[in-house]
């Protein structure tokens, strides 16, 4: 799996999970989240050569097409596969609210 | 939806479905498929600015992050959303076989 266990250890050019810490205020301009101040969002990036963690038959076809036609810009892309939620604390007036924001943390990647 | 009805009519730079005809023999080196000789595979490409057909909360966060930090290359990617199968005819010896290859045709796209 193209997850932290593999990707953070084996830094490489192909599609993999990349660490990314996002500070809500500085990086997003969000002042409404009280806690946490930021979180490890991570993201997916890197090349998708033929058969590198292809998600579908179409992405396999596309990466093979791109190998044979390298001048074409039709190639698969490295995107998130498994995502996890993030629990946040914010206030409505003086009332604290705890909410789970779904699909906030990327845990693994794929070529799609 | 970023499908043919929208994307083939409104040519644009943002993430959208792009037409792509693949000739099995010429583009993939596949000689085993007897019929069809090729098919409209299509593919997804284009920019993923903030809120342009974002797939998840993470892709929305990432595109906003990329807007505020434009020098970072951590941005969502335009990938396939809905896919359809393709029916093919091939031979094993002299015996014709009809098979449905799943997820071969892209029908719509998303920013993920």
């Amino acid at each position: 799996a193209l997850d932290a266990a593999y990707c953070f250890r084996n830094v490489q050019d192909n599609c993999c999970l990349r660490p990314l810490y996002i500070d809500f205020k500085r990086d997003l301009g969000w002042k409404w989240i009280h806690e946490p101040k930021g979180y490890n969002a991570n993201f997916c990036a890197g090349a998708c050569p033929y058969l590198w963690s292809s998600d579908t038959q179409h992405s396999r076809v596309l990466s093979l097409y791109n190998t044979i036609n390298p001048e074409a810009s039709a190639s698969p892309c490295c995107v998130s596969q498994d995502l996890e939620p993030l629990t946040i604390l914010y206030y409505i007036g003086k009332t604290p609210k705890i909410e789970q924001l779904s699909n906030m943390i990327v845990k693994s990647c794929k070529c799609s | 939806a970023l499908d043919a009805a929208y994307c083939f009519r409104n040519v644009q730079d943002n993430c959208c479905l792009r037409p792509l005809y693949i000739d099995f023999k010429r583009d993939l080196g596949w000689k085993w498929i007897h019929e069809p000789k090729g098919y409209n595979a299509n593919f997804c490409a284009g920019a993923c600015p903030y809120l342009w057909s974002s797939d998840t909360q993470h892709s929305r966060v990432l595109s906003l992050y990329n807007t505020i930090n434009p020098e970072a290359s951590a941005s969502p990617c335009c990938v396939s959303q809905d896919l359809e199968p393709l029916t093919i005819l091939y031979y094993i010896g002299k015996t014709p076989k009809i098979e449905q290859l799943s997820n071969m045709i892209v029908k719509s796209c998303k920013c993920s």
């Epitope: 084996n10 990349r18 660490p19 810490y21 | 970072a72 290359s73 951590a74």
Partner: nanobody, 119 residues
Framework: QLQLVESGGGLVQPGGSLTLSCAAS????????MSWVRQAPGKGLEWVSV????????IYSDSVKGRFAIARDNAKNTLYLQMNSLKPEDTAVYYC????????????RGQGTQVTVSS
Amino acid sequence: QLQLVESGGGLVQPGGSLTLSCAASGFTFSHYPMSWVRQAPGKGLEWVSVIGSDGGTKIYSDSVKGRFAIARDNAKNTLYLQMNSLKPEDTAVYYCAEGDSRYVRGRTRGQGTQVTVSS
């Protein structure tokens, strides 16, 4: 709070050597890949090197390949950059960064350490 403190810079003659250090705190250092980036006077940030979380994989930019060596000591939460055969064009402020700076450019946390290569 994540903190990175660079040290070891200085003035060196062309062909000379220096070793930069980066002390990390506020996060699980051993879990993350780490990078070195640099900023020459009047230029943007340039990625120099990245190392995997366990130190096994190392990648270098073409401009420093064969001259610089990245290393880490997870027990000491420290990242290193051994710089050999230094050239005037290596003159820059050097920063360490958490993660792979090939993909997240333009982000520095520490103050950096100045390296000047001049005769």
